[in-house]
């Protein structure tokens, strides 16, 4: 079985203020077996922006189930953007462990950028 | 108009690597921010994507066939590349590269991960010693 | 990944009627993430419908698309002689993107 890989295809994407971002991020393999968490920025200043474990992020939908259990996609829509929310996503595989879940693997991260609302 | 059309051996070896060539015609491939696909048929068969990658160099793969597909992209000859390693006689299908008219690089794009609407016409190779 | 069960496998109709053909997915799908395809013997399969219901550039009016969730239908509203063939859905709003097995439309 190859190591499970962590796709983030786009870069970088550009969305108008006030609209939703779409964010894709997909495994290549269901194991190991743990939950996925989506970051903003790297480092011990990231800031969690879902975490499909636990958690309300009201402005966080999924675009696929990510309740079901052969789901190797885990890519987000984030509503609503404003300004404050540029920065690089990374989408992060954990490790199931005890006490703690342990990070596995990142994506390559995508750059959101965010264009003034059209007038 | 933009045309896709498929090119490479038709016969390859158990074992051996399969390479195909998709040359686009009619507009640059790097014009957009279209991603690029290649979908294989086996004969009196359904479809089954195999991977899809952007001009600038981004792939996904289908994960029952990763570890053995590589598609690249040069953007200098306007084409886009399929190699297939480790073929078996089940690897003996039609090949088809296509374009995913879908912007990804706009956020507000919606996600998801590929549909079709050009294709080419389609290159059989058989697997066979 | 998502499984999408094509029905009925063969479809015998003749020209001038109705045809109508079903996509059930495995899992939820939205329906921007639902797509159907005409292909005919020895040719590339051509892109009918997007979205679940948009039809692409160039596409007669007879095709429409409907459904949402697990169930979608392509409805050809009156088969003309050049619409027997295969016809294959396709979603990807799941990853990996996933391909029907087919129905087949024939001359009865």
């Known amino acids: 079985e190859d190591e499970l890989q962590v796709i983030q295809p786009e870069k970088s994407v550009s969305v108008a203020a006030g609209e939703s971002a779409t964010l894709r991020c997909a495994m290549t393999s269901l194991i190991p077996v743990g939950p996925i968490m989506w970051f903003r920025g790297a480092g011990a200043g990231r800031e969690l922006i879902y975490n499909q474990k636990e958690g309300h992020f009201p402005r966080v939908t999924t675009v696929s189930e990510l309740t079901k259990r052969n789901n190797l996609d885990f890519s987000i829509s984030i509503s609503n953007i404003t300004p404050a929310d540029a920065g690089t996503y990374y989408c992060v595989k954990f490790r199931k462990g005890s006490p703690d879940d342990v990070e596995f693997k990142s994506g390559a991260g995508t750059e959101l950028s965010v264009r003034a609302k059209p007038s | 108009q933009l045309q896709l059309q498929e090119s490479g051996p038709g016969l390859v070896k158990p074992s051996e690597t399969l390479s195909l060539t998709c040359t686009v015609s009619?507009?640059?491939?790097?014009?957009?921010?279209?991603?690029w696909g290649w979908i294989r048929q086996p004969p009196g068969k359904g479809l089954e994507w195999i991977g899809s990658?952007?001009?600038?160099?981004?792939?996904y793969y289908n994960p029952s066939l990763k570890s053995r597909v590589t598609i690249s992209v040069d953007t200098s000859k306007n084409q886009f590349s399929l190699k297939l390693s480790s073929v078996t006689a089940a690897d003996t299908a039609v090949y088809y590269c296509a374009r995913d008219p879908r912007d990804y690089s706009s956020g507000s794009s919606g996600g998801g991960w590929g549909y079709f609407d050009l294709w080419g016409r389609g290159t059989l190779v058989t697997v066979s010693s | 990944e998502i499984v999408l069960t094509q029905s009925p496998g063969t479809l015998s109709l003749s020209p001038g009627e109705r045809a109508t053909l079903s996509c059930r997915a495995s899992?939820?799908?939205?329906?921007?993430?639902l797509a159907w395809y005409q292909q005919k013997p020895g040719q590339a399969p051509r892109l009918l419908i997007y979205?679940?219901?948009s039809r692409a550039t160039g596409i007669p009016d007879r095709f429409s698309g409907s459904g949402s969730g697990t169930d979608f239908t392509l409805t050809i509203s009156r088969l003309e002689p050049e619409d027997f063939a295969v016809y294959y859905c396709q979603q990807d709003g799941n990853f990996p993107l996933t391909f029907g097995g087919g129905t087949k439309v024939e001359i009865k």
């Open positions: 990658i952007s001009y600038s160099g981004s792939t």
């Open positions: 899992q939820s799908v939205s329906s921007s993430y």
């Open positions: 009619g507009g640059s491939i790097s014009s957009s921010s279209y991603y």
């Open positions: 979205g679940a219901s």
